[in-house]
Interface confidence: medium
């Protein structure tokens, strides 16, 4: 029989976390006790791996997505907020099919 | 080129299962989130699932808790919804959806790319 | 679940004219974060949906200027400036600020 992860809806303000501590807050919503969330220690990448990742801007961790990001530099755009931009923050889509 | 290939679909009996595979070239699999969005004949878009990058969470609709379960291989770059119990209103065709990028610090959740499809056809 | 409403449900054209879709959600669609996850798909005839526009008003990778989004809190528009043949689908608008994730039913652009 195959095995159905309970549902832990992401908290409606956790779509883009912003943790910067080792542990990131999870709230139970939904599942019962989390079931689905294997691994209950995960590290905040930020603070690992992707320590470095981002390099004119501040690495974010976007926890119930297990996906991390970039928060850009005013001048600065791109995956790794490595492209600088004439104009503040103008959206430039081209490089966005990475 | 991102590409997402479905396959899996079929003719299945009410009550029965299937299992829908999506396979995943053009981008680093593995950093995104990804989604199956169905489509019944002649109506609109229903979203299916929802599964995080290391497949630690997954979303469901109440339409289908309970009777579907997403996962993921990223080492094989592949998305799989697993069927079970299914009924004459699952017939549809299930894309396979990339959800990204992220991009300026903003995840906006947008299916960006989307595979063309595989048919579930659910009749007795 | 919040509810997306789109009209017109059917949209006739003359090649070379302004087209707007509406889309009105059953709730705010504004995010804690401050943002609003309003996404616009298209889907041509025969073929698997396409992203458009994404948070209202931001035009994906390669999509044509004149297609353009705009509103916010709970109604919003698609806009296409001067409507070309390629342009013959069906337009759908989606929510991912609140789960389930949500689309509209839908508007069929056609050529007259």
């Known amino acids: 029989s195959v095995r159905v992860e309970q549902v832990v809806k992401p908290p409606q303000n956790k779509t883009e976390s912003e943790n910067t501590s080792d542990k990131p807050k999870r709230k139970k919503k939904g599942g019962k006790n989390g079931k689905n969330r294997r691994n209950r220690k995960k590290k905040n990448p930020c603070n690992a791996e992707f320590q470095n990742f981002c390099i004119h801007g501040e690495c974010k961790y976007i926890e119930h997505l297990e996906a991390v990001t970039c928060k850009c530099q005013q001048e600065y755009f791109g995956e790794r907020c490595g492209e600088k931009s004439m104009k503040t923050h103008s959206m430039i889509d081209s490089s966005l099919s990475k | 080129e991102v590409q997402l290939v479905e396959s899996g679909g079929g003719l299945v009996k009410p009550g029965g299962s299937l299992r829908l595979s999506c396979a995943a070239s053009g981008f680093t699999f593995s950093s995104y989130p990804m989604s199956w969005v169905r489509q019944a004949p002649g109506k609109g878009l229903e979203w299916v699932s929802t599964i995080s990058t290391g497949g630690t969470y997954t979303y469901y609709p109440d339409s289908v808790k309970g009777r579907f379960t997403i996962s993921r291989d990223n080492a094989k770059n592949s998305l799989y919804l697993q069927m079970n119990s299914l009924r004459a209103e699952d017939t549809a065709v299930y894309y396979c959806?990339?959800?990204?990028?992220?991009?300026?610090?903003?995840?906006?959740?947008?299916?960006?790319?989307w595979g063309q499809g595989t048919t579930v056809t659910v009749s007795s | 679940d919040i509810v997306m409403t789109q009209s017109p449900l059917s949209l006739p054209v003359t090649l070379g004219q302004p087209a707007s879709i509406s889309c009105r959600s059953s709730q705010s669609l504004v995010h804690s974060d401050g943002n609003t996850y309003l996404h616009w798909y298209q889907q041509r005839p025969g073929q698997s949906p396409k992203l458009l526009i994404y948070?209202?008003?931001n035009r994906f990778s390669g999509v044509p200027d004149r297609f353009s989004g705009s509103g916010s809190g709970t109604d919003f528009t698609l806009k296409i400036s001067r409507v070309e043949a390629e342009d013959v689908g069906v337009y759908y608008c989606?929510?991912?600020?609140?789960?389930?994730?949500?689309f509209g039913g839908g508007t069929k652009v056609e050529i007259k």
């Open positions: 948070k209202v008003s």
């Open positions: 989606s929510q991912s600020t609140h789960v389930p994730y949500t």
């Open positions: 959806a990339r959800q990204g990028p992220i991009y300026y610090g903003n995840y906006y959740y947008a299916m960006d790319y």
